[in-house]
């Protein structure tokens, strides 16, 4: 956030940039949390825009019995590996076809034991406040589907009647990792020493990190004709003086007519 300065007072301004602001020859360049000519004002909203999507990764192991293991399968650039990968991917795409969050599979390692396939199942969902539940449900469906297919598609009398056959007992879920996104935590961190006063409010399922000085939210502080300003002790209303009134009170809601006060003074002199 920048504020430009013109004229002779600029050099003077340069040495007065506050809150870590730096002078660029024309103006104070303010750090994220501040704005104003001297970076003296605290912003009332911080962009913590969530990622568009949240991902999850499931580490799985299955045992394929319909392919003979060869050393070439360990070499990811070999024809054996490439063909295996193509078929395995095709098979898994069929298995997980009913899961909207399913993105694909990534083989990490093939090893002996028929062919033991260590792989990741990749899941992705659009960000909503309920993303954890959505991905948790998707991982459960993945477990159900892989358990079902590795139980059903098995070799019978050395014959595999499917694209791939599996060893029922070789199916394991090692680990599940979900990208963590915590807007409350991000908001607190980015607000630094003002963290106690910034909160997350949702609008159209999008999180906004705001202080009570940001208008239009349920936590917004109404300063009436005054100006809301954030300090280390919290949001405060700076009350204004008009030609006719002085305003005071916590929310600048108490107006005193100047004429009455002046009249009072004249009466005393």
């Amino acid at each position: 956030r920048t504020t430009t300065c013109f004229g002779d007072g600029c050099q003077n301004t340069a040495s007065r940039c506050k809150n870590g602001g730096t002078w660029d020859g024309l103006k104070c360049q303010c750090p994220n949390l501040y704005y104003g000519e001297l970076c003296e004002e605290v912003v009332s909203s911080i962009d913590i825009g969530p990622p568009e999507t949240i991902s999850a990764q499931m580490e799985l192991t299955v045992t394929v019995t319909s392919v003979k293991f060869t050393e070439e399968l360990k070499n990811h650039s070999s024809q054996e590996f490439q063909e295996f990968k193509q078929t395995f991917t095709e098979q898994m795409n069929i298995v997980y076809s009913g899961i909207p969050e399913y993105v694909g599979v990534n083989i990490t390692k093939l090893r002996l034991g028929s062919v033991v396939v260590e792989h990741d199942v990749l899941l992705r969902t659009k960000y909503t406040p309920e993303y954890k539940t959505v991905l948790d449900n998707a991982t459960e469906v993945v477990k159900e589907k892989i358990t079902k297919v590795t139980t059903q598609q098995i070799m019978i009398n050395d014959i595999c009647s499917d694209m791939m056959c599996f060893n029922t007992t070789g199916t394991q879920v090692q680990n599940i990792t979900v990208t963590q996104y915590d807007p409350e935590e991000d908001c607190r961190k980015m607000a630094k020493e003002y963290g106690d006063y910034f909160v997350v409010e949702y609008r159209d399922q999008k999180p906004y990190c705001i202080s009570p000085c940001e208008p239009g939210f349920s936590v917004s502080k109404n300063c009436n004709l005054g100006k809301c300003q954030m300090s280390l002790s919290g949001p405060q209303c700076l009350c204004v003086t008009t030609e006719t009134h002085w305003y005071s009170g916590e929310t600048c809601n108490q107006g005193t007519q100047k004429s009455l006060v002046y009249g009072h003074h004249h009466h005393h002199h």
């Epitope: 392919v67 003979k68 063909e83 595999c160 009647s161």
Partner: nanobody, 124 residues
Framework: EVQLVESGGGLVQPGRSLRLSCAAS???????MGWFRQAPGKEREGVAG???????IYADSVKGRFTISKDNAKNSLYLQMNSLRAEDTALYSC???????????????????RGQGTMVTVSS
């Protein structure tokens, strides 16, 4: 990925014979190989298959009339078709499994690579 090119199709009279060939771009010794056909307006069906160890399988409709064989040295697959019938009219395509596929005793999913096919018309 293996490339497959069929040849040997044509117009033949009922009761006569025809030999189809399939040339593969790579090693076929460690693959299950097969022949499939698709008659006009019908679904594709398996005709014959051969596993890497030479075990063969045939569709009931061609048993005793068709013979599948392969020449590993030439990377070629063949289908000898005898006593041809009008119902054998179809586009015949050669197919291959991935390398090291085992348990090929079906004429279905295991064949993932396919050629463009060669047309066989049986008519008097």
């Amino acid at each position: 990925e293996v490339q497959l090119v069929e040849s040997g199709g044509g117009l033949v009279q009922p009761g006569r014979s025809l030999r189809l060939s399939c040339a593969a771009s790579g090693d076929i010794t460690r693959r299950c190989m097969g022949w499939f056909r698709q008659a006009p307006g019908k679904e594709r069906e398996g005709v014959a298959g051969i596993s890497e160890d030479g075990i063969t399988i045939y569709a009931d409709s061609v048993k005793g009339r068709f013979t599948i064989s392969k020449d590993n040295a030439k990377n070629s697959l063949y289908l000898q078709m005898n006593s041809l019938r009008a119902e054998d009219t179809a586009l015949y395509s050669c197919a291959a499994s991935i390398l090291n596929r085992v348990g090929c005793r079906q004429l279905s999913y295991e064949y993932i690579y396919r050629g463009q096919g060669t047309m066989v018309t049986v008519s008097s």
